[in-house]
Amino acid sequence: PGPPAGSPRVSSDPRADLDSAVLLTRSLLADTRQLAAQMRDKFPADGDHSLDSLPTLAMSAGTLGSLQLPGVLTRLRVDLMSYLRHVQWLRRAGGPSLKTLEPELGALQARLERLLRRLQLLMSRLALPQAAPDQPVIPLGPPASAWGSIRAAHAILGGLHLTLDWAVRGLLLLKTRL
């Protein structure tokens, strides 16, 4: 080994990564909100919709105070990976009715992938465990009907909206602990 030499700083550090994750989450939340509103305009929802394959909401307002960095990042990453799978499925199997929303769904998927990469980078830099999702991946079959795919889209966008909403709060809280 040669004599000690310094390394130039790389483009970001864990705190900058966390800032970047907050910004990406906020912009993804805005996109999701807008897309959900478009869905409601084009295909009015009759009540709340759910999908068994979607993750259950990780946090409530009451539990925000007790959040720990590893738990939040791990859970957020696993949940967002699930939503990414569901968005990919919607784009693939959503049928003609959802084709009009293809550009928006494509942009949403790209942003989701970018946020997941940023979270992974943050977890790597902090050296936090990054276990792959342990719950079995539920195979997503084709929707039973055109209306089935619309109901699924409502459920996916609604769930993603709630997940991103707690994610922004959680990440902002974690910034004070890093």
Epitope: G6, S7, D13, R15, R117, L126, A131, L178
Partner: antibody, heavy 114, light 111 residues
Framework: EVQLLESGGGLVQPGGSLRLSCAAS????????MHWVRQAPGKGLEWVSV????????YYADSVKGRFTISRDNSKNTLYLQMNSLRAEDTAVYYC???????WGQGTLVTVSS | QSVLTQPPSASGTPGQRVTISCTGS?????????VHWYQQLPGTAPKLLIY???ERPSGVPDRFSGSKSGTSASLAISGLRSEDEADYYC???????????FGGGTKLTVL
């Protein structure tokens, strides 16, 4: 400028012990996970161990599990590797690295031989 | 035997474009874990070249680029220069280890 400076390497007999240190400067040490990665003469890189930014998580390669212990002192910006029951196959340059790893030290040579 | 597979050697002439591949499995690269690339010049420590599949740290020339698809990744070097002669390693997170795994390294020769 980021600096990682390893020390503590040297010649040791099989079964012996060594403690490596890595002094960090130029970045927020307490915000980074830290790794030890080694490279045997003429060979590739082999990850050895990692410790999370706050010291709460520690993981080891199977080849060193139970023999090596990683630790850190964030107040001193220093990373450590306690190596016990050393074997000939542990002979390598040991690098301390931060983050992804993003930053690497210049390495310290550990030779295990009788 | 490395968990990530790289060709042991690659070569090219100055100005050429060379590509180095890195093949993993469904438990590392294929599971969505990002790939990072390191350059190790003779007698020196490794240096981060590409992180998160295709991002360049500041100071790394844009002649270096990375990509990832499925269980594989690749590093491309365009406008090859003599100073690019080095060993190149890919790395990805391995959830079973909770640490990174490295490829066996590729020795790049500039002819």
């Amino acid at each position: 400028e980021v600096q990682l400076l390893e020390s503590g390497g040297g010649l040791v007999q099989p079964g012996g012990s060594l403690r490596l240190s890595c002094a960090a400067s130029g970045f927020t040490f307490s915000s980074y996970g830290m790794h030890w990665v080694r490279q045997a003469p003429g060979k590739g890189l082999e990850w050895v161990s990692v410790i999370s930014y706050d010291g709460s998580y520690k993981y080891y390669a199977d080849s060193v599990k139970g023999r090596f212990t990683i630790s850190r002192d964030n107040s001193k910006n220093t990373l450590y590797l306690q190596m016990n029951s050393l074997r000939a196959e542990d002979t390598a340059v040991y690098y301390c690295a931060a983050g992804v790893p993003d930053y690497w030290g210049q390495g310290t040579l550990v030779t295990v031989s009788s | 035997q490395s968990v990530l597979t790289q060709p042991p050697s690659a070569s090219g002439t100055p100005g050429q474009r060379v590509t180095i591949s890195c093949t993993g499995s469904s438990s590392n690269i294929g599971a969505g874990y990002d790939v990072h690339w390191y350059q190790q010049l003779p007698g020196t420590a490794p240096k981060l070249l590409i992180y998160s599949n295709n991002e360049r740290p500041s100071g790394v020339p844009d002649r270096f680029s990375g990509s990832k698809s499925g269980t594989s990744a690749s590093l491309a070097i365009s406008g090859l220069r003599s100073e690019d002669e080095a060993d190149y390693y890919c790395a990805a997170w391995d959830p079973s280890l909770n640490g990174p795994v490295f490829g066996g390294g590729t020795k790049l020769t500039v002819l």
